[in-house]
């Protein structure tokens, strides 16, 4: 019996009946054994086939077999109901070997030419399986020449049998207070040859509760307890299971904060597995009762470990832990069933006693001493001498705990001194100076410090004066002795003030003319305003209309009088404003340099002389009455003039204050 070619020789060739293409003889038996490499199979087909036809091919036949299995018994020329001829069929070995047997019996009724066949080895596609057969690989099958290999989806690993995919299902840790876990692929069949471990690990104080839900189907055995696949549940206290079969296990209250779930499967079976919904519980904390005027959020039926609540107070109430203020409050339930913080109170907001208002007073409107939420107070300023700046003085205790004005301001109102009040009514012109009476010039300030000079009170802590009068003291402000509220220059009865700082106009040059002869003195304390101490007003924009040529201004001071001595009593003089060109011309003759009178100056006095300010009056105010407001304002500052005060054809020269309003306002607002 010929064996045919053997691997590793090239496996292909031709087979034919003895004598082919002639007729074959009787009583012939021929056997070929073909062997292909591992992973290959043999393919065979006939190009000619002509054998005696007999019932079930009992006489002459070609038999194809692979291993123990007969693939086909062939005879005749064409297939019948009970006999088969190869026709155009191709035959394949089941493995890598194919046996071909040709036999003829003792007689043939007529001559038959036999067969011719060709064979070749070809790769087996192990990945293709017949319907109903088990797949070659669990997940993915990959064919190659001479063999195949299996691979697995993500989350699986190839078992050592090289075909089964075991689930990578260990090491999952669940730390949430509730959740779900299930067998791999649930509700599809779970994988074979797998060992899964799941951990539920909650904070100490929690107790895990397990509920099996939906369906339960784990391979079982009628007599032995879960010998194939099983589910076990382990806690630090006890073990539950093993579980298998089709019945949902009962709820398991573990009384433990840690649970290990083990699921083991074998190599066979087709079951859907299991699903667990777990929850947790803990010792509840006392139910939080909201304090009066507050509410708890969130509202729950019970509060257990890690649950929290916050307290929110109604508007006008604030969180207080005893006396300690809290902006917010959240308490957390602890494992021993107690809250981590004591409950605060919602106390009505108390704005406290309102601050005292300098030069003013406060009145309780809601009730005597009532300072709680929505209480109203009324500030007012001391009448006559002070007026309230900006707001109406009505303040409400708001929810933030601050007294707040109707404009939303939390700062105190300001009692600003009333300016320009004087006891004097404008009299007729009086030759020379006249003694001032109490309250006539309450803005008058006496400045002592080397020489005698004057100034005018602005607000309650500033003095307006001439730069030349305080130039020497600009770096030693504390050397200035400032007195007010008195008429007599030498009187011991006066209000003393001290200088904090001296601000000389940056455009003033000492000993080089008197342009920009203006200065401000900041007092180190506010002075109390009364009938004898009242500030002068600064000129309004419209003030020029009261300072035209021939309009009367009043100068006051303790300067030299006609007798040549400093006045003991405060003196004043009413003098008209002089035309600017006329004044400029008067001071263009020697000994005065050209340009002595600038646009920053105004002149006042009589052409005939006799009424003037003089040395010692420097820095004092030349004031005018604003007939619309009925307040006095400073139009000029005593600056310079002729060597002989009150000289005919010469005039007193004053710093024109209206030109310096921005400078004054900037200094005062900045300092």
């Amino acid at each position: 019996t010929p064996l045919g070619p053997k691997w590793p020789e090239p496996v292909f060739g031709r087979l034919a009946s003895p004598g082919f293409p002639g007729e074959y003889a009787n009583d012939q038996e021929r056997r070929w054994t073909l062997t292909a490499p591992p992973g290959y199979r043999l393919r065979l087909y006939f190009t000619h086939f002509d054998l005696e036809l007999s019932h079930l091919c009992e006489y002459d036949f070609v038999k194809l077999s692979s291993g123990a299995k007969v693939l086909a018994t062939l005879c005749g020329q064409e297939s019948t109901d009970t006999e088969r001829a190869p026709g155009k069929d191709t035959f394949y070995s089941l493995g890598s070997s194919l046996d071909i047997t040709f036999r003829s019996d003792y007689s043939n009724e007529k001559p038959f030419t036999g067969f011719e066949a060709f064979y070749a080895a070809e790769d087996i596609d192990e990945c293709q399986v017949a319907p109903g057969e088990a797949p070659t690989c669990d997940h993915h099958c990959h064919n190659h020449l001479g063999g195949f290999y299996c691979s697995c989806r993500a989350g699986y690993v190839l078992h050592r049998n090289k075909r089964t995919c075991s689930a990578l299902c260990s090491g999952q840790v669940f730390t949430q207070r509730s959740g779900e876990l299930s067998s791999p692929e649930y509700p599809r069949p779970y994988p074979k040859l797998s060992s899964c471990t799941y951990s539920i690990s909650l904070e100490e104080g929690f107790s895990v509760i397990l509920d099996f839900v939906e369906s339960f189907d784990v391979e079982t055995h009628p007599e032995t307890l879960c010998p194939y696949d099983f589910l076990k549940i382990q806690t630090d206290r006890e073990e539950h299971g093993p579980f298998c079969g089709k019945t949902l296990p009962h709820r398991i209250e573990t009384k433990s904060n840690t649970v290990t779930i083990t699921f083991v499967t074998d190599e066979s079976g087709d079951h859907t597995g299991w699903k667990i919904h777990y929850t947790s519980t803990a010792q509840p904390c006392p139910y939080p009762m909201a304090p009066p005027n507050g509410h708890v959020s969130p509202v729950q039926a019970k509060y257990i470990l890690k649950d929290s609540f916050s307290i929110f107070c109604e508007t006008g109430y604030e969180l207080l832990q005893g006396h300690l203020p809290l902006k917010s409050f959240t308490a957390v339930c602890q494992k021993d069933g107690s809250w981590d913080r004591p409950m605060p109170a919602c106390s009505i907001v108390d704005c406290g006693p309102p601050d005292d208002l300098p030069s003013g007073r406060v009145e309780y409107i809601t009730g005597p001493g009532v300072t709680t939420y929505k209480a109203v107070i009324q500030y007012s300023c001391e009448e006559t001498f002070y007026t309230m700046k900006v707001n109406d003085g009505k303040y409400v205790c708001e929810a933030d705990g601050f007294w707040t004005s109707s404009k939303g301001e939390k700062s105190l109102p300001v009692c600003e001194p009333v300016c320009g009040l004087s006891a004097r009514t404008t009299g007729g012109r009086i030759y020379g100076g006249q003694k001032a009476k109490p309250g006539d010039f309450p803005w008058q300030v006496l400045i002592l410090g080397g020489t005698t000079a004057a100034g005018a009170l602005l607000y309650d802590n500033w003095v307006l004066t001439a730069a030349h009068a305080v130039y020497e003291q600009k770096h030693d402000a504390s050397a200035l002795d400032i007195r007010m509220g008195t008429l007599k220059r030498l009187s011991p009865h006066y209000t003393q003030a001290w200088s904090e700082a001296v601000f000389i106009h940056e455009g003033y040059t000492h000993d080089a003319g008197f342009d920009n002869d203006i200065a401000l003195i900041k007092l180190n304390n506010k002075v109390v305003i009364n009938s004898n101490i009242t500030p002068i007003c600064l000129p309004r924009k419209e003030a020029e209309s009261f300072m035209r040529t021939d309009d009367i201004g009043t100068a006051s001071g303790w300067g030299l009088t006609q007798r040549g001595f400093l006045a003991r009593n405060l003196m004043y003089v009413d003098i008209p404003i002089v035309d600017h060109q006329k004044c400029t011309a008067a001071y263009e003759k020697p000994p005065y340099p050209r340009g002595s009178v600038t646009a920053n100056m105004l002149c006042a006095g009589l052409e005939s002389g006799g009424k003037d300010s003089c040395r010692g009056d420097s820095g004092g105010a030349l004031v005018f009455l604003d007939s619309e407001t009925e307040r006095w304002f400073v139009g000029g500052i005593v600056s310079w003039g002729s060597m002989n005060c009150g000289e005919a054809g010469q005039y007193g020269v004053y710093t024109k204050v209206i030109n310096y309003i921005p400078w004054i306002e900037n200094i005062i607002s900045d300092f």
Epitope: L320, Q321, G322, L324, P325, S328, P344, F402
Partner: antibody, heavy 117, light 112 residues
Framework: EVQLQESGPGLVKPSQSLSLTCTVT?????????WHWIRQFPGNKLEWMGF???????NYNPSLTSRISIIRDTSKNQFFLQLNSVTTEDTATYYC??????????WGQGTLVTVSA | NVLMTQSPLSLPVSLGDQASISCRSS???????????LEWYMQKPGQSPKLLIY???KRFSGVPDRFSGSGSGTDFTLKISRVEAEDLGVYYC?????????FGAGTKLELK
Amino acid sequence: EVQLQESGPGLVKPSQSLSLTCTVTGFSITSDYAWHWIRQFPGNKLEWMGFINYSGRTNYNPSLTSRISIIRDTSKNQFFLQLNSVTTEDTATYYCARSYDFWFGYWGQGTLVTVSA
Amino acid sequence: NVLMTQSPLSLPVSLGDQASISCRSSQSIVHSNGNTYLEWYMQKPGQSPKLLIYTVSKRFSGVPDRFSGSGSGTDFTLKISRVEAEDLGVYYCFQGSHVPVTFGAGTKLELK
């Protein structure tokens, strides 16, 4: 973590004002709670002086109300103690601290102020 | 003002001993909200005081569980179950229920 640091002159003359600063890091003074000044006299006696809360409201020890002022600068996360008209009796180590549900959970390291001519 | 009286003023101990410090208030320090704001502080030389216990018995974060507080009304106690070297210092009780809040004079825990 919240940290507090006191600073200011170590020597003040009688009748003058004592001014101290507490600089807070790790927590905004406007976020919550009360911010306190406490002092410890020689001999270790402790005295609470007052606090300013997250919104800027103050609460003082009644024995100091006429002399004490606590203010803050939210832009610098600082609060300040001013104690007027000091005497030698005000010589002490001055601490700033923060409260919660307790009064003084977090303290500065303290600064010694001596009142002496 | 609520006066807080501590006893003893000095407490000599050996390491490992239990220590007990008493504090008595001149009036009840139960606040009108029902809470008792009694606190214990400990101070070592050259350091600022440190909070140990608040609302009578709650331990501040980081305070070892060998420290415990108890009491009610006007009588309160701080216990240290086993004294360690780091526990030596001055202990102050404090009431925060009534303004002005007040401290005790202190108890010095020292080695025998």
